[in-house]
């Protein structure tokens, strides 16, 4: 038996694709959603972080360290940041 395979090209409209990963905006607290090859990514406003911007708080990305302070930690949702302050400055934000 010979099996004949017919290859068809079909133009798929957006309606046929179903909901995209950003449909309904999974990002909380005013975060903006962008689609990635496998899922989605939220860009969070200052003061929020986490996969869906659901966690309230400041991270190193917010630039919390003043007067030349170096921000250590704060890279993942469970860790708080610490500012290492240059000589002559102190306080949690080297202020």
């Amino acid at each position: 038996d010979h099996h004949h395979h017919h290859h068809e090209q079909k133009l798929i409209s957006e309606e046929d694709l179903g909901p995209g990963p950003c449909d309904g905006n999974p990002c909380a607290n005013g975060g903006s959603c962008s689609e990635t090859p496998r899922s989605f990514e939220c860009t969070c406003p200052r003061g929020f972080y986490g996969l869906r911007c659901e966690v309230s708080g400041v991270t190193c990305a917010d630039g919390p360290c003043f007067n030349g302070g170096l921000c250590v930690g704060g890279a993942d949702p469970d860790s708080a940041y610490i500012c290492h302050c240059p000589p002559g400055f102190q306080g949690s934000n080297c202020e």
């Epitope: 630039g63 919390p64 030349g68 000589p87």
Partner: antibody
Amino acid sequence: QVHLQESGPGLVKPSETLSLTCTVSGGSISSYYWSWIRQTPGKGLDWIGYRYYSGNTNYNPSLKSRVTISLDMSNNQFSLKLSSVTAADTAIYYCASIGVAGFYFDYWGQGTLVTVSS
Amino acid sequence: EIVLTQSPGTLSLSPGERATLSCRASQSISRSYLAWYQQKPGQAPRLLIYGASSRATGIPDRFSGSGSGTDFTLTISRLEPEDFAVYYCQQYGTSPITFGQGTRLEIK
């Protein structure tokens, strides 16, 4: 003006510990943060870590499990220990002081080449 | 970590010309905590600029830095023979401290 001078063996065997000392003159070791940086032809400049007399210490995560930086206040020196070395740790090692207005490097030693080889 | 990408890799110019070196960060560098260094063969790097635009002690005013966020520039207004070297940028806003891969400035 701060002057820095590295010293230590130029050849270390694989799996052993690299030990370097930086002697500081022209400034008190309690006045600055002190850092180590290394340079390889392939990877360029790599920050290793820093330490402050008050206890603030910070290491590059890529080396953290193998690095110790310590201060010797009485001799105005600070040191680097890097354990379990491999050929990838062959580099020029620099000691440096960190600026008073931020974590940039304002004074550097001349550098010392450390080769890891059996 | 913040990745710094410098361009061009090599810049060929003549003495007296203007040099423009770029440093681009993978994410915004807080408060413009960026430094520039010059390195000559067999020597340690030398601090030129910190805070994106402040000249270090003893650095001639032909060197200037600018930029904020993710894009930073080092400009040498009129190249002197001693300016031909490798230049590195470094960010110190977020740990780990990172450096760019360098731009080689060579005589044309």
